[in-house]
Interface confidence: medium
């Protein structure tokens, strides 16, 4: 039946309870509440190995794996988000094998699609073909104008602009902490129909691309005197529950996948763009690296200098931003006003699943050994003809990879080398 085109059904997967509610349910049951108390004591100031060596701690963990706390999730921007995340990580930091490269997201999976946003964008703006209007118009300027026509968007945008532009002293450009907070409020409280249009507007020229880059007022919120090491920055981010959660969510929703046609997990552009926007206003704030209208490259403010023997891991971490075909395709698709339609004609299952922790590095997904696109291939990714191969250490695969070329940059014949990390 066509339904099986959609991928695996969710056998036995129950929709997650939010962690605040799960905590209340646990507190009402003496066995659960006492084990949860034990677990929190076990985790306080101890590493995982010490904790698991303690039989009482192990027993508490096993009992809690059967409770609603185990697969509880949080919603971005929910009333008690921080409390929810604290509860989530209090359980999950005890379950992971030390530092994971990719951590499972504490947030509920996103089921809405980009097409929903386009529909709303056209309602709000009164145009039928938003966000794509015409080749000549400056979409980023249009997005700012649209924001100003909405009271909530205008108020919160004005707020972050004034805070992030406020110079404290000749040596201190601005109050970065306050600027970040104002940005978080903007991206969490303003509907994505407005925020996405400002962040992901498509550009034909440098002036437009520079406006797009300036959206988050990078001189205050993004740039710094020096670029820290990316793994150090990730370490700092992971000490904060909110930042850690947003980064995990980005990886869960934007990690390049060889199993899907768009390179995005579950072919969901909307989930990836939402996760990207969710990182703005934290230590890991990403932004466009330059004012190039066509070559979309985003990155957090960090580099891999001084990584020592962790250079490969650092480069892999950075590539998830700078060379990520899922993220690039998602940004382009939004700019073009297109979404992928992967549902068959007929009944289908919503194949959303609780994100899994991934341990193995995967390869950049922009490897393709063909440039022939037939006679009328979909133009969603006009400048991107890509789909990668999986990480694998076999000699055969390495040879296969070094022979592949990409035509993401027109006229270039650059060979992308695979990661040689552990598989």
């Amino acid at each position: 039946s066509p339904s099986s085109l959609q991928g695996p059904e969710l056998h036995g997967w129950r929709p997650p309870v939010d962690c605040v509610r799960a905590n209340e349910l646990c507190a009402a049951e003496s066995n659960c509440s006492s084990r949860y108390r034990t677990l929190r004591q076990c985790l306080a100031g101890r590493d995982r190995n010490t904790m698991l060596a303690n039989k009482e701690c192990q027993a508490a963990l096993e009992v809690l794996q059967e409770s609603p706390l185990y697969d509880c999730r949080c919603k971005r921007g929910m009333k008690k988000e921080l409390q929810c995340l604290q509860i989530y990580w209090s359980i999950h930091l005890g379950l992971t094998e030390g530092e994971e490269f990719y951590e499972a997201s504490p947030y509920e999976p996103v089921t809405s699609r980009l097409s929903d946003i386009f529909r709303l964008a056209s309602i709000f703006s009164g145009t039928g073909a938003d966000p794509v209007v015409s080749a000549k118009s400056n979409h980023c300027l249009d997005a700012a104008k649209a924001c100003n026509l909405n009271d909530n968007c205008k108020k919160l945008r004005s707020s972050y602009i004034s805070i992030c532009n406020r110079e404290i002293s000749p040596t201190e450009r601005c109050n970065r902490r306050k600027c970040h907070k104002a940005l978080r409020q903007f991206f969490d409280r303003v509907p994505s129909e407005y925020t996405y249009r400002m962040l992901f507007c498509s550009c034909q020229d440098q002036a437009c691309a520079e406006r797009r880059r300036q959206t988050i007022l990078p001189s205050c919120s993004y740039e710094d005197k020096e670029k820290p090491n990316c793994l150090d920055l990730r370490g700092v981010c992971r000490t904060d529950h909110l930042c850690r959660s947003r980064l995990a969510d980005f990886h869960a929703n934007c990690r390049a996948s060889y199993q899907t046609v768009t390179s995005c997990p579950a072919d969901n552009y909307q989930a990836c763009l939402g996760s990207y926007a969710g990182m703005i206003g934290f230590d890991m704030t990403p932004n466009y690296v330059d004012s190039s209208p066509t070559g979309i490259v985003v990155s957090p403010w960090c580099s891999c200098r001084g990584s020592g023997n962790m250079e490969e891991e650092c480069e892999k971490f950075l590539r998830d931003f700078t060379e990520n075909p899922c993220l690039r395709n998602a940004i382009q698709a939004f700019g073009n006003g297109t979404d992928v339609n992967v549902s068959p004609k007929g009944p289908s299952f919503q194949a959303t699943q609780a994100p899994r922790v991934e341990k193995t590095p995967s390869l950049p997904d922009d490897l393709s050994d063909s440039t022939s696109l037939g006679t009328s291939v979909i133009t969603t990714c006009t400048s991107v003809q890509e789909q990668g191969l999986k990480a694998n250490n076999s000699k055969e695969l390495s040879m296969c990879f070094t022979e592949l070329t990409t035509n993401i940059i027109p006229g270039s014949n650059k060979v992308i080398k695979p990661n040689s990390g552990p598989s």
Epitope: P2, S4, L5, Q6, G7, P8, S257, Y258, Q259, T260, V261, T262, P265, A266, D267, N329, V340, N341, V342, S343, P344, K345, G346, A351, R356, V357, E358, K359, T360, P361, S362, S368, D369, S370, S372, L373, G374, V377, I378, T380, C381, V384, Q385, E386, Q387, L389, K390, A391, N392, S394, L397, C400
Partner: antibody, heavy 119, light 112 residues
Framework: QVQLVQSGPEVKKPGASVKVSCKAS????????MHWVKQTPGQGLEWIGR????????NYNQIFKDRVTMTLDTSSSTAYMELSRLRSDDTAVYYC????????????WGQGTLVTVSS | DVVMTQSPLSLPVTLGQPASISCKSS???????????LNWLQQRPGQSPRRLIY???KLDSGVPDRFSGSGSGTDFTLKISRVEAEDVGVYYC?????????FGGGTKLEIK
């Protein structure tokens, strides 16, 4: 319902090329990879490669890489597989297969196209 | 390439009796996303292959529940609880975790 209909049998001379077509219906063509698989009595099933109808990207098995070209005509929901420099050991049934987001998750197969290479 | 080894090559079974086919891979098929891309195909005489099971144990719609799949890592098994006449054909395991994807050599199920 989902259907993959392939072109008819072909008889070719060694050194020639063959182009097999596969017309899809009953599902969103651009949402799922199209795979091509070779079947011979001696070698069993062999994966030739896949094409992504969403963006035209291809991944070919190294064994066939120098001789295979996969293309699309999305307006007619048709995929093509061309094999050049044919040899006698290319005599086989070629299947197109599609469905499922996932790499190995193929649940619809064409009826197969027999290609005979003979001098 | 990942080598998929199936056994036995031929499996004569009495109608109504159980049958079991083994498939071993030269590398673990657990993918980085936590899924194991191992499928079982059935090819009846003169027909195209048809997928019975995906992701190790999930039955495709329309597949009788006498079929079941199990295993993890490198060892997988297809079981038929009670063989029926329509089950005659060749069964293949097929991995989609590693590039290039590869098939087992096939197991021919026949009625005794």
């Amino acid at each position: 319902q989902v259907q993959l209909v392939q072109s008819g049998p072909e008889v070719k001379k060694p050194g020639a090329s063959v182009k097999v077509s596969c017309k899809a219906s009953g599902y969103t063509f651009t949402g799922y990879f199209m795979h091509w698989v070779k079947q011979t009595p001696g070698q069993g099933l062999e994966w030739i490669g896949r094409i992504n109808p969403y963006n035209g990207a291809t991944n070919y098995n190294q064994i066939f890489k120098d001789r295979v070209t996969m293309t699309l005509d999305t307006s007619s929901s048709t995929a093509y597989m061309e094999l050049s420099r044919l040899r006698s050991d290319d005599t086989a049934v070629y299947y197109c297969a599609s469905g499922g987001h996932y790499y190995g998750n193929v649940d619809y197969w064409g009826q197969g196209t027999l290609v005979t290479v003979s001098s | 390439d990942v080598v998929m080894t199936q056994s036995p090559l031929s499996l004569p079974v009495t109608l109504g009796q159980p049958a079991s086919i083994s498939c071993k891979s030269s590398q673990s098929l657990l993918d980085t996303d936590g899924k194991t891309y191992l499928n079982w195909l059935q090819q009846r005489p003169g027909q195209s292959p048809r997928r019975l099971i995906y992701l190790v144990s999930k039955l495709d719609s329309g597949v009788p529940d006498r079929f079941s799949g199990s295993g993890s890592g490198t060892d997988f098994t297809l079981k038929i609880s009670r063989v029926e006449a329509e089950d005659v054909g060749v069964y293949y395991c097929w991995q989609g975790t590693h590039f290039p994807q590869t098939f087992g050599g096939g197991t021919k199920l026949e009625i005794k």
